[in-house]
């Protein structure tokens, strides 16, 4: 018989124990109970009666198909209830009536068609997070469903088979910070959108085929929508439906952020927003994020000239993992307010980057991320970016660079440079002297002897250094992370000569636990405040007798130290 393991704090773990019923022996001491991934099927009225102080009850994927009406009557202190992915084909309001303290409720992945015959949640006045719906059977949203709920932090509704949406069903919730809607078709989208305009701050639309979406004027009063963020995840769009979606932005004038994640655009970027709306529609949008956009015809993609004016005020753009190999010069020149650009995981090479970072392109750009592209020459990359007069931060990590030359020309204001995971074997004077932060972690460096007068932070973990770099190279260094190298020791001279060092992370090196090193550590209790990963990451590699022991605990023999 499987048993429940509980600790002194009343946390009981019964996950994946093949329980076929709620285990006995639960007491008022039980604060947290996890019975997920079992075969419980039934919860009777007395099964949880002793758990009067229970705060968290997790019953995810427990095979439950029946819950007695008063099964939760003693759970007045319950704050978190997860009933997701069970076999509950109907829901009862009597389950939830006693749960006046409930803040989190997850009912997703159960085979109900509706949310019951009466308002399930009207007693849950403290509810902050609610997740409902399923992939296939849940098909109707009615006005009674969310009655009584006035304010939620998160509401997630999975309704991929929506057949009917009763107007104003979601309007009763006056304030929703984050609404996630899994909708397979766009048929009811306009109706839902009208109902949530005055309540939702962050709308996330998932798994939706928007190819046939058509805008029509909303019959709403003059609304000052609080919506600040709009996200589309795993959605299908066309050039035409994108134009139609843009029209929704007329109603959310405070919108600041738009995100497209794992979407498919069956088009070539031939967008044609109606001229009158162009300036208005993205009025306050500052951040546009596109991740893993799939464009089957990406080689035919237009230069987006039709939406240039839409993007002139945008400050932050991310286009990640979307097969970008070239940003047209004219497009770059129109991104007049752009301060941050992330083109990670794309196909950029220096020669095409030159076209993008053309004269007058990205005039306000301060941070550029080109991590994991096809860049091959640090010198060429630096030179091409000279046009970016305001560039202070550059991330070119995870590119496979040829050996670094001795000299390179960089934008004059460069303060941050990330060259991690680039396969570099030596650091040369090509690195700009203006840097305040340098990341060269996860490379093949066996030494570092470059003078960087303004450097405040050096990240050099996962390399092959045998000693700490000379302190005189970095007169103002505050942070050094040098984990997972081949450092065998450090001394008073080495550490004492970093006058401003506040943080040193040097764990997981191959320390030789000599008398000198161990006595130095004993003499310097203040080291603990500098070594952030002390003491667990600082282990003796040798001598064999001390192998694996923490430096803090290692004690050399008297003989060894007085030879």
């Amino acid at each position: 018989q499987a048993s429940l393991s509980c600790d002194a704090a009343g946390v009981c773990d019964g996950s994946s124990r093949s329980f076929t019923s709620i285990p006995s022996g639960l007491t008022a001491n039980t604060k947290k109970l996890d019975l997920s991934f079992n075969k419980i099927t039934y919860i009777g009225h007395g099964d949880l009666r002793a758990c009067v102080n229970l705060r968290v009850l997790t019953l995810e994927s427990s095979g439950i198909n029946t819950i007695e009406g008063d099964a939760f009557y003693s759970l007045g202190s319950l704050e978190h209830l997860d009933l997701s992915n069970n076999h509950l084909s109907s829901l009862s309001s009597s389950w939830f009536r006693p749960l006046s303290s409930l803040k989190y409720l997850n009912l997703m992945g159960n085979p109900y068609r509706t949310l019951g015959e009466t308002s399930l949640f009207s007693n849950l006045t403290n509810l902050q997070t609610l997740r409902v719906g399923n992939v296939d059977t849940f098909s109707e949203i009615r006005r009674i469903d969310f009655a009584g709920l006035t304010s939620l932090n998160e509401l997630e509704i999975q309704v991929l088979s929506l057949g009917n949406y009763e107007s104003r069903s979601l309007q009763s919730i006056r304030d929703i910070y984050h609404l996630t809607l899994h909708l397979s078709e766009s048929a009811f989208l306009l109706g839902i959108f009208a109902d949530i305009l005055s309540s939702v701050r962050y709308l996330e639309l998932r798994d939706t085929n928007l190819a046939r979406f058509q805008f029509s004027e909303l019959s709403v009063d003059e609304i000052n929508s609080p919506m600040k963020k709009l996200a589309f995840r795993n959605a299908d769009l066309t050039d035409k439906s994108f134009n139609e979606l843009l029209k929704l932005l007329r109603y959310i004038l405070e919108l600041m952020e738009v995100e497209f994640d794992h979407c498919t655009l069956n088009g070539v970027g031939n967008f044609n927003p109606s001229e009158s709306d162009v300036v208005r529609e993205l009025g306050k949008v500052e951040t546009v994020t596109i991740r893993s956009l799939h464009i089957p015809q990406f080689y035919l993609f237009y230069d987006l000239s039709t939406v240039y004016s839409l993007l002139e005020k945008v400050k932050r753009i991310t286009v990640e993992n979307s097969k970008v190999f070239l940003v047209p010069c004219s497009f770059s020149q129109h991104l007049k307010s752009l301060e941050f650009l992330d083109l990670s995981e794309n196909l950029m090479v220096e020669e095409y980057l030159k076209n993008s970072a053309c004269e007058g392109g990205w005039p306000s750009l301060q941070s550029l991320v080109l991590s994991q592209n096809h860049l091959r020459s640090i010198r060429k990359t630096a030179e091409i970016l000279l046009t970016l007069k305001n560039l202070t931060a550059l991330d070119i990590s995870k590119n496979s660079f040829q050996p670094m030359p001795d000299s390179c020309q960089w934008p004059g204001k460069m303060r941050f440079l990330n060259l991690s995971s680039t396969g570099i074997q030596a650091v040369k004077t090509c690195i700009p002297q203006t840097l305040e932060v340098l990341d060269v972690s996860n490379n093949n460096l066996d030494s570092f002897s470059l003078f960087l007068p303004r450097l405040q932070e050096l990240y050099i973990s996962r390399n092959k250094l045998k000693t700490l770099p000379e302190a005189s190279l970095f007169p103002v260094l505050q942070v050094m992370k040098i984990r997972e190298n081949a450092i065998s020791t450090f001394s008073k001279d080495q550490l004492g000569s970093f006058p401003k060092l506040e943080t040193l992370e040097a764990g997981d090196n191959h320390f030789i636990c000599s008398c000198e090193l161990l006595s130095f550590i004993l003499e310097r209790p203040a080291l603990v405040h500098v070594l952030v990963d002390w003491p667990d990451s600082y282990l003796c590699d040798s001598p064999p007798r001390l192998h694996g022991q923490r430096l803090q605990d290692a004690r050399p023999s008297v003989l060894e130290c007085h030879q």
Epitope: S292, L300, N321, L326, C329, V349, Y352, N355, Q372
Partner: antibody, heavy 118, light 111 residues
């Protein structure tokens, strides 16, 4: 250093299928596209299609769309190209090549000779 | 499909002479300021080797006697002083539109 090593020569009968492999090393396999190109004896080069290992997306020359399948095993850094319903005019050297910058083929495998004959 | 026509079919030169190979596309291969045209060299029994990409960018490790030029539909590969090791077939290739296509090739031989 970057290398693409292809499987050995194949002799096939008309109507059969052939599956060629291309093992990559010296670079992050999922960061680049892998293309397949063939060259019939004494002829020019003909592009078959590509795959992006990161997301598995493929694109084919219409001439091969119904007969060619390109797949990858990212754990083994290997790309595969299967050609079905072989005919004598499929006799050629088949090359895999790394796609850089989305537009050019900067490293090529040594080629696999496929002979289709009854 | 974009058809690439290379000329001449064969180019026979003495060492040190200048070679000019031409590639004409049936439609423009421009993509917003960049010509998506490549040149490859292939020696007998070997795979092709990239020489030039984006019409004029010389691939790393390629001798500087090779240069590429052109835009729109007309492209040229020049070898400033031909050497014995330059013999082989030269192919142009466009990546502006799918399917990607190659020219029929120009054979360079030394007299």
């Amino acid at each position: 250093q970057v290398q693409l090593v292809q499987s050995g020569s194949e002799l096939k009968k008309p109507g059969a299928s052939v599956k060629l492999s291309c093992k990559a090393s010296g670079f992050t396999f999922t960061t680049y596209g892998i293309n397949w190109v063939r060259q019939a004896p004494g002829q020019g080069l003909e592009w078959i299609g590509w795959i992006y290992p990161r997301d598995g997306s493929t694109n084919f020359n219409e001439n091969f769309k119904d007969r060619a399948t390109i797949t990858v095993d990212t754990s083994a850094s290997t790309a595969y190209m299967e050609l079905s319903s072989l005919r004598s005019e499929d006799t050629a050297v088949y090359f895999c090549a790394r796609l850089t910058g989305g537009t050019f083929l900067d490293y090529w495998g040594q080629g696999t000779t496929v002979t289709v004959s009854s | 499909d974009i058809v690439l026509t290379q000329s001449p079919a064969t180019l026979s030169l003495s060492p040190g002479e200048r070679a000019t190979l031409s590639c004409r596309a049936s439609e423009s291969v421009e993509y917003y300021g960049t010509s998506l045209m490549q040149w490859y060299q292939q020696k007998p029994g070997q795979p092709p080797k990239l020489l030039i990409f984006g019409a004029s960018n010389v691939e790393s490790g390629v001798p500087d006697r090779f240069s590429g030029s052109g835009s729109g539909t007309d492209f040229t590969l020049k070898i400033s002083r031909v050497e014995a090791e330059d013999v082989g077939m030269y192919f142009c290739q466009q990546s502006r539109k799918l399917p990607w296509t190659f020219g029929g090739g120009t054979k360079v031989e030394i007299k």
